[in-house]
């Protein structure tokens, strides 16, 4: 068997089972484990006089190792003393020695309860410049506690005069500070509070959590616009993850296809927002064939602050399709704005949601920018539905008075597009697409006066057309409102006007 | 193929701790985001704590200040050290592996270890 | 935190029945709804995961569906082996959850 140092045991009475008046008493140590022979055990009594007695070692048969027991009885006034038991293994090394201090009996004791508390961040979440720990020892026996702070398991140099000790009823409190620079607070590391009493280890840990509440994290995965399917013909995917906290680790995202094919370059961008919180969001193209023909497509993101890996998945919307119905409108010149109009795009009844809405004027697509489209909405039936509201000049109606509101979306036929055209005075201009034909629905322009209705292009509404009937969720001034009742006009005819 | 086997469980008296151990063999540890997993005798499945592949970590209310999930790739071991525990700790362990392209599950789970708190 | 609630606790059912076992969270889950299989002894089995997708190895009889709050297991024609305790998981640790377990349904033999 190789070299084995011991382990020492104090070996105690309980000290109620010890007479009040008895005038000696025997308390042990117990060395055990070691090898080779042998162990030499003195005792420290103090200024008690007192007489060793060692027992010749025994082996443990299991391992050959050694175990043997010194005994130390005294006499006189014991109860308030201590005893140190000095074990040393010449074999382990010349100075190898284990020093246990303790009393002759062993009262029963209520352990402490340890727990850290930290100091909170300011308002804004941010840590201040110093940290303050605080350790509390609760509830145990009144008796010597040794408290000791550790830093990633290393013991710290800290003042511990500033432990308080309190006593409530027949149980005592004692508590430690530990003050911490924000630096050493943010590297990451552990700290411990440990404390010893009646011979027995107690503690608890605490570090910095992780930068982000993981709850905040969201990764979103969005389907190609039906725009870049059909017209450009070179459709996207995109990956979003907000909402994270900008911190020393990336964000990984990996594309995969469920098909197990390779995908193609995906391009990133990070921004930073208002609010602290990063955005990352990275884009795929994918092939239009294969899109179509149902192909599933998986963003995979991992970050140091989600606790485990998100996977989002995308692929082409099953389910019934239906064509979506384009309404165009212009609302009438508004008091105080007669250089400008507001074109109105009612899209309704289309299956699935997925859709894009265009304007044009002079057979040239006016970008983006330029119209707000709500979020596809559902109607009462099965359908959704959209509006889209576009600005106009008084420059831009001079030049051609002819704007058109375009749909694209899978259902529509022959070209996966749908489109009216509207004009802001429809009277004077050359026949636009919506004098066609009698709309289902008439909007009606609800102004800040309830009047009689205004002609506009020398025609009426209705008598049963009337205002205020489901009022759309609408992007800003002015609020147009969706008559809900049919339009039974016998000749073809469009009416804006004043409510 | 892929084996997860828990170690570390038994009696424990109430106030003392112990350290589990989950052996990962099949495959790449660091890969994958790893799950510790309890239910008690008659019980459904509680969740504890995970360790991402990072080495971050995160555990249900319940179990923070008492629990502590750790991992180490080099020894294709992931750890769960219990202090102060308590009868209600008694349970089943299970480490189990989430799945490598996420949000997707625990698709491998070992045979658990029992932990018996009583004095 | 995103609770999981699942209903109803235990139903008995004979062998050939259809089974449906519900789940609802208390939030939208946006992906990485799992379900498990357990039996006795055992540890838990992944059934289905992402909503529907049947895990490598489960029978097609097995099936997923829901989204948002509400999810469903449906076990189309009961066989003497899927007598056991299933469980429903919110497996999307973005939206970090004590219990991200459901309670648990036991399938007996009626």
């Known amino acids: 068997a190789s070299t084995q140092s011991p382990s020492v045991f104090p070996l105690t009475r309980c000290c109620k089972n010890i007479p009040s008046n008895a005038t000696s008493v025997t308390l042990g140590c117990l060395a055990t484990g070691y090898f080779p022979e042998p162990v030499m055990v003195t005792w420290d009594t103090g200024s008690l006089n007192g007489t060793t007695m060692t027992l010749p070692a025994t082996t443990l048969t299991l391992s050959g190792h050694y175990a043997t027991i010194s005994l130390l009885t005294v006499s006189g006034a014991w109860a308030k003393q201590m005893f140190t038991c000095r074990v040393a293994h010449t074999p382990s090394s010349t100075d190898w020695v284990d020093n246990k201090t303790f009393s002759v009996c062993s009262r029963d004791f209520t352990p402490p309860t340890v727990k850290i508390l930290q100091s909170s961040c300011d308002g804004g979440g941010h840590f201040p410049p110093t940290i303050q720990l605080l350790c509390l020892v609760s509830g145990y026996t009144p008796g010597t506690i040794n408290i000791t702070w550790l830093e990633d398991g290393q013991v710290m140099d800290v003042d511990l005069s500033t432990a308080s000790t309190t006593q409530e009823g027949e149980l005592a409190s004692t508590q430690s500070e530990l003050t911490l620079s924000q630096k050493h607070w943010l590297s990451d590391r552990t700290y411990t509070c440990q404390v010893t009493y009646q011979g027995h280890t107690f503690e608890d840990s605490t570090k910095k959590c992780a930068d982000s509440n993981p709850r905040g994290v969201s990764a979103y995965l969005s389907r190609p616009s039906p725009f870049d399917l059909f017209i450009r013909k070179s459709p996207t995917i995109t990956c979003l993850v907000v909402d994270l906290a900008p911190s020393k680790g990336t964000v990984n995202l990996t594309w995969s296809r469920a098909s197990g094919k390779p995908v193609n370059h995906s391009t990133r961008k990070e921004e930073k927002q208002r609010n602290g919180t990063l955005t990352v969001t990275s884009t795929l193209p994918v092939g239009t064939r294969d899109w179509i023909e149902g192909e599933t497509y998986q963003c995979r993101v991992t970050h140091p602050h989600l606790p485990r890996a998100l996977m989002r998945s995308t692929t082409k919307t099953s389910g019934p399709r239906a064509a979506p119905e384009v309404y165009a409108f212009a609302t009438p010149e508004w008091p105080g704005s007669r250089d400008k109009r507001t074109l109105a795009c009612l899209i309704q009844n289309f299956m699935p949601e997925d859709i894009s809405v265009q304007w044009l004027h002079n057979e040239v697509q006016l970008p983006d920018a330029r119209h707000s489209t709500t979020q596809p909405r559902k109607t009462k039936g099965s359908g959704f539905f959209v509006f889209s509201r576009l600005e106009v000049t008084r420059a831009e109606w001079e030049q051609k008075d002819e704007f058109i509101c375009r749909a694209v979306h899978e259902a529509a036929s022959p070209s996966q597009t749908v489109q009216r055209a509207v004009s802001v005075n429809p009277g004077l201009a050359g026949g636009s697409a919506q004098s066609q034909r009698a709309p289902d629905r008439v909007l009606c322009h609800s102004g800040q006066q309830q009047g009689l209705p205004r002609a506009a292009g020398g025609s009426v509404p209705h008598p049963r057309c009337h205002c205020g009937a489901g009022r759309a969720d609408w992007p800003g001034p002015p609020e147009l409102d969706v008559c809900v009742e049919e339009a039974e006009g016998e000749a073809p005819w469009t009416w804006t006007g004043l409510c | 193929q892929v084996q997860l086997v828990e170690s570390g469980g038994g009696l424990v008296q109430p106030g003392g701790s112990l350290r589990l151990s989950c052996a990962a063999s099949?495959?790449?540890?660091?890969?994958?985001?790893m799950t510790w997993v309890r239910q008690a005798p008659g019980k459904g499945l509680e969740y504890v704590s995970i360790?991402?592949?990072?080495?971050?970590?995160w555990y249900a209310n319940w179990a923070s200040g008492r629990f502590t999930i750790s991992r180490d790739n080099s020894k294709n071991t992931v750890y769960l050290q219990i202090s102060r525990l308590r009868a209600e700790d008694t349970a089943t362990y299970y480490c189990?592996?989430?799945?490598?392209?996420?949000?997707?599950?625990?698709?491998?789970w070992g045979q658990g270890t029992l932990v018996t708190v009583s004095s | 935190d995103i609770q999981m609630t699942q209903s109803p606790s235990s139903v008995s059912a004979s062998v050939g029945d259809r089974v449906t076992i519900t789940c609802q969270a208390s939030?939208?889950?946006?992906?990485?709804l799992a379900w498990y299989q357990q039996k006795p002894g055992q540890p838990p089995k992944l059934l289905i995961y992402d909503h529907s997708t049947l895990a490598s190895g489960v029978p097609s009889r097995f099936s997923g569906s829901g989204s948002g709050t509400e999810y469903a297991l449906t076990i189309s024609s009961l066989q003497p082996e899927d007598f056991a305790t299933y469980y429903c998981?919110?497996?999307?640790?973005?939206?970090?959850?004590?219990?991200?377990f459901g309670g648990g349904t036991k399938v007996e033999i009626k």
């Open positions: 939030e939208s889950i946006y992906s990485g």
């Open positions: 189990a592996r989430e799945t490598h392209h996420g949000s997707s599950g625990i698709d491998h």
């Open positions: 360790i991402n592949t990072y080495g971050n970590h």
């Open positions: 998981q919110h497996a999307d640790y973005a939206h970090h959850s004590d219990n991200v």
């Open positions: 099949g495959f790449t540890l660091s890969n994958h985001d």
